[in-house]
């Protein structure tokens, strides 16, 4: 799969492949994988992809199920790239405070916060 | 500050304190702090709080600016707790696939994705 495929298209295709291969993926009834308790998904990317790795190692490969795992590894690559962009640019305090304000504002409005 | 204050109220108060103390915080004109290039904030919590630590070490403490940094450390504690909850519960593959589908769905609709 060319990595040039837009990430948004990659995600859509992966969702479709996930539905297609669901029966095959759940074949192992004894397998247990960590599942986050909350819905702040971005905080859990590491655990999600560890789980995907576990699932891949337990799944019979071949056909489009391979494409599913290839897609998921490209999505991981994209997220790793985004994580790199968290700390690459050193800016003045003013810009950092604008970003911090945005971050707290997002926490305030969009995060799923349990008291 | 009691940690019993609801996190949502804590975030609101912190936003107000950030506005109040802006002038004091930007006093150091040579200080540079990593600022994420994108708006997928949850991916960058580690760098954001490292930046807050840098800022705190360079800011004259006293009065309500101390409360600002105390609040920020409580918010960090909350996020660290959320991160712990990413991997604590081991579930069957079906539950993991439901979560993975939700995660990709959120990526598809809510993440800030550049092609």
């Amino acid at each position: 799969i060319p990595t040039e495929i837009p990430t948004s298209a990659l995600v859509k295709e992966t969702l479709a492949l996930l539905s297609t291969h669901r029966t095959l993926l759940i074949a192992n009834e004894t397998l247990r994988i960590p599942v986050p308790v909350h819905k702040n998904h971005q905080l859990c990317t590491e655990e999600i992809f560890q789980g995907i790795g576990t699932l891949e190692s337990q799944t019979v490969q071949g056909g489009t199920v391979e494409r599913l795992f290839k897609n998921l590894s490209l999505i991981k690559k994209y997220i790793d790239g985004q994580k790199k962009k968290c700390g690459e640019e050193r800016r003045r305090v003013n810009a950092f405070l604008d970003y911090l304000q945005e971050f707290l504002g997002v926490m305030n409005t969009e995060w799923i916060i349990e008291s | 500050i009691p940690t019993e204050i609801p996190t949502s109220a804590l975030v609101k108060e912190t936003l107000a304190l950030l506005s109040t103390h802006r002038t004091l915080l930007i006093a150091n004109e040579t200080l540079r702090i990593p600022v994420p290039v994108h708006k997928n904030h949850q991916l960058c919590t580690e760098e954001i709080f490292q930046g807050i630590g840098t800022l705190e070490s360079q800011t004259v403490q006293g009065g309500t600016v101390e409360r600002l940094f105390k609040n920020l450390s409580l918010i960090k504690k909350y996020i660290d707790g959320q991160k712990k909850k990413c991997g604590e519960e081991r579930r069957r593959v079906n539950a993991f696939l439901d979560y993975l589908q939700e995660f990709l769905g959120v990526m598809n609709t809510e993440w800030i994705i550049e092609s």
Partner: antibody, heavy 119, light 107 residues
């Protein structure tokens, strides 16, 4: 493709206000800051300020603070720059420009809007 | 505010010439500088960001260098479409500030 399309030319009297619009298309509006820059006839470029459509936060060049107001309408993916108490020296072409990333370079510019202030 | 001093303010050159424009910041701006091209009656267009990174689609004859306070834009072999005014912009600190511009004219 990514585009910023600005409103048409305006002629205003001194003391009046003007509101210039900048309609974004081809990308998710809330992902990028919108900057405003002006250029007086035969002169250089001058930064007015930026607005973050993600949270409506705006920051101004001190020179324009109190006279310029930056706003957005997320439902139409449009940014606005209003300048009040106009004087003849405000005659200029006003540009909107998109930040590539947070506090980053301007990767897309609007075509510009000429504002003429004359009695 | 950070002052950006650009030189020369204008220059005459021929097609094929190598052209260099410099920009000096009044304080350290790291590498947060972009170079912008503007043709008469047209909107500006960013060519280079972060001092030396060429934007996609911009010809490779354009290059940038420098960090801290001193920056340079070079056009290795001037083409007819390159006759324009060039501005540097610092986006390191608020307010963002531009150089006064360098007009590149045909000799």
């Amino acid at each position: 493709q990514v585009q910023l399309v600005q409103s048409g030319a305006e002629v205003k009297k001194p003391g009046a206000s003007v509101k210039v619009s900048c309609k974004a298309s081809g990308y998710t509006f809330t992902n990028h800051h919108i900057n405003w820059v002006r250029q007086a006839p035969g002169q250089g470029l001058e930064w007015i300020g930026y607005i973050n459509p993600y949270n409506d936060y705006s920051r101004y060049n001190q020179k324009f603070k109190g006279r310029a107001t930056l706003t957005v309408d997320k439902s139409t993916s449009t940014a606005y720059m209003e300048l009040s108490s106009l004087r003849s020296e405000d005659t200029a072409v006003y540009y909107c420009a998109r930040d590539y990333g947070n506090f980053w370079y301007f990767d897309v510019w609007g075509q510009g809007t000429l504002v003429t202030v004359s009695s | 505010d950070i002052q950006m001093t650009q030189s020369p303010s204008s220059l005459s050159a021929s097609v094929g010439d190598r052209v260099t424009i410099t920009c000096k910041a009044s304080q350290d701006i790291n590498s947060y500088l972009s170079w912008i091209q503007q043709k008469p009656g047209k909107a500006p267009k960013t060519l280079i960001h972060r001092a030396d990174r060429l934007i996609d689609g911009v010809p490779s004859r354009f290059s940038g260098s420098g960090s801290g306070q001193d920056f340079t834009l070079t056009i290795s072999s001037l083409q007819p479409e390159d006759f324009a005014t060039y501005y540097c912009l610092q986006y390191d600190d608020f307010p963002y500030t531009f150089g006064q511009g360098t007009k590149v004219e045909i000799k």
